[in-house]
């Protein structure tokens, strides 16, 4: 007996071929001998089966001796043995219909679990193998689970169901809801405008929720909420903002915050959380601000950085086009009695300059000028 695998909701064509290449009488029946469809001359006739409105055939193929049974919008319960009667012969086809669905929504927060459930007809013993967009294979029976979803798990999951050495493939689109970056760092000179961007790693037609940016300044003993906002159909509206600093927020996605001035007292770490409507849990992105200040007080030229810097970062003071006078893995460096000229304060990581501030040192009888 021929075995055909079908997918729930799909359309399947069960073939039946006569030796004569012409239109002759045929009937399709189910295992209970209930007529599904057949022909009377050129007319398609239908029986009292449950498939009535979902069963069809192709008149144009009858003249070729082909008498297909086409079943639309397949259901698991359509799994059955179908019998084609033509030319005093009986052709049996076993149809097995499977369904594969994600347990919950196919839009899941980063870190959540994905469970795929296989619907199968009674008596079947299928095996399932799924391949994630990043190439990870998982195997199982009626259910497959993936815990701790990552951003790379977003995309099309391809699942193959094997039964009777036949296979049917399912494609499920999974969207992992997350920010593009888990963490970002912004380096600014004192007084510069600061732009924080929080791009999302997904696109959906309607995006509604609420968010907040909590800030832990390096100089402060506790964190404080800098801004709260609402998101409605991708439109951003500010609910509450602190007076110091007075952040500004863009009205459209991606989420965008502007700090008018980078000041040492603002240097630190922030955590932007976004709670999406109808989702349990929140999206998070960490943001860090490092602020640099270069000053000359009397005979002392000082360069300082505030904020979360890694121990491997190097802070240097050098006269333009000359070797560094001082270079340390510290958050402050200074030069006593600096000679006149344009001095550069550099924050670098393995030779790559992250932040630079210039200060002009005038001959000792005049005051310094900061460009």
């Amino acid at each position: 007996k021929k075995v055909v695998l079908g997918k729930k909701g799909d359309t399947v064509e069960l073939t039946c071929t006569a030796s004569q290449k012409k239109s002759i009488q045929f009937h399709w029946k189910n295992s209970n001998q209930i007529k599904i469809l057949g022909n009377q001359g050129s007319f398609l006739t239908k029986g009292p089966s449950k498939l009535n409105d979902r069963a069809d055939s192709r008149r144009s193929l009858w003249d070729q001796g082909n008498f297909p049974l086409i079943i639309k919008n397949l259901k698991i319960e359509d799994s059955d043995t179908y019998i084609c009667e033509v030319e005093d012969q009986k052709e049996e086809v076993q149809l097995l219909v499977f369904g594969l669905t994600a347990n919950s929504d196919t839009h899941l927060l980063q870190g959540q679990s994905l469970t795929l459930t296989l619907e199968s007809p009674p008596g079947s013993s299928p095996s399932v193998q799924c391949r994630s967009p990043r190439g990870k294979n998982i195997q199982g029976g009626k259910t497959l689970s993936v815990s701790q979803l990552e951003l790379q798990d977003s995309g099309t999951w391809t699942c193959t169901v094997l039964q009777n050495q036949k296979k049917v493939e399912f494609k499920i689109d999974i969207v992992v809801l997350a920010f593009q970056k888990a963490s970002s760092i912004v380096y600014k000179k004192e007084g510069e405008q600061v732009e924080f961007s929080f791009p999302l790693a997904f696109t959906v037609e309607k995006l509604t929720g609420s968010g907040e940016l909590w800030w832990q300044a390096e100089r402060a003993s506790s964190s404080k909420s800098w801004i709260t906002f609402d998101l409605k159909n991708k439109e951003v509206s500010v609910k509450r903002v602190t007076q110091d600093p007075k952040l500004q927020m863009g009205k459209k996605l991606p989420l965008h915050l502007t700090l008018p001035q980078a000041l040492p007292q603002y240097a630190g770490s922030g955590n932007l959380t976004l709670a999406l409507e109808a989702k349990t849990g929140k999206l998070h992105q960490e943001v860090n601000l490092v602020v640099m200040r270069a000053t000359q007080l009397q005979k002392n030229l000082t360069c300082e950085v505030w904020g979360p810097t890694s121990p491997k970062l190097m802070l240097s003071l050098k006269l333009e086009n000359k070797e560094a006078k001082v270079s340390k893995r510290e958050k402050a460096v200074w030069v006593l009695n600096p000679e006149a000229g344009m001095w550069q304060c550099l924050l670098s990581d393995s030779g790559q300059v992250l932040l630079e501030s210039n200060i002009k040192v005038l001959p000792t009888w005049s005051t310094p000028v900061q460009p």
Partner: antibody
Framework: QVQLQQWGAGLLKPSETLSLTCAVY????????WSWIRQPPGKGLEWIGE???????NYNPSLKSRVTISVDTSKNQFSLKLSSVTAADTAVYYC?????????WGQGTLVTVSS | DIQMTQSPSSVSASVGDRVTITCRAS??????LAWYQHKPGKAPKLLIY???SLQSGVPSRFSGSGSGTDFTLTISSLQPEDFATYYC?????????FGQGTKLEIK
């Protein structure tokens, strides 16, 4: 809801090969046949041929010698190639899903054959 | 090949009118006939299949009848959006063939 999106070269020279592709989105690919139909300017509709997911084809005898329809089930796409085109092949070409009736249809692609 | 002949080739009518278009097959096609509506720059749209079954989403003012070789498409009360070209198509045998079309114009 099933949608068909088609594309291909719109301007050809006589004797060249016409090549069009149709992608099927949002529905079953197996179980149906996938057709190409054309409509020359100011004329009626002409069925070119069809294919199913397993590659079984039926062609209009009037075009059979020049037509090849192929399928790529991994992408839910099917393609039309019509060789040795002449000005008489200038038409809007449509792809469509069919069991017995054509529904839905692609948006159509105007192919002009001119030297 | 089965030839499909539509009549008239064009018809002028007003909003609210009842319009009938006929289609004749060169041989018996039982009920293997469909009707399509085609507007300029758009894809044809299936209206009626199996000679008399109304396609889902199509207004009930459209109806089809006939069997064998003679078929009709009737629009009971013309609406402004109905002005288009109408085609019949046989699905009885390969190659599938269409009528030459009936252009329905505003009077």
């Amino acid at each position: 809801q099933v949608q068909l999106q088609q594309w291909g070269a719109g301007l050809l020279k006589p004797s060249e090969t016409l090549s069009l592709t149709c992608a099927v989105y949002g529905g079953s690919f197996s179980g149906y046949y996938w057709s190409w139909i054309r409509q020359p300017p100011g004329k009626g509709l002409e069925w070119i041929g069809e294919i199913n997911h397993s590659g079984s084809t039926n062609y209009n005898p009037s075009l059979k010698s020049r037509v090849t329809i192929s399928v790529d089930t991994s992408k839910n796409q099917f393609s039309l190639k019509l060789s040795s085109v002449t000005a008489a092949d200038t038409a809007v070409y449509y792809c469509a899903r069919v069991i017995n009736w054509f529904d839905p249809w692609g948006q159509g692609t105007l192919v002009t054959v001119s030297s | 090949d089965i030839q499909m002949t539509q009549s008239p080739s064009s018809v002028s009518a007003s909003v609210g009118d009842r319009v009938t278009i006929t289609c004749r097959a060169s041989q018996d096609i039982s009920s293997w006939l469909a009707w399509y509506q085609h507007k300029p720059g758009k894809a044809p749209k299936l209206l009626i299949y199996a000679a008399s079954s109304l396609q889902s989403g199509v207004p009930s003012r459209f109806s089809g009848s006939g069997s064998g070789t003679d078929f009709t498409l009737t629009i009971s009360s013309l609406q402004p959006e109905d002005f288009a070209t109408y085609y019949c198509q046989q699905a009885n045998s390969f190659p599938y063939t269409f009528g030459q079309g009936t252009k329905l114009e505003i009077k």
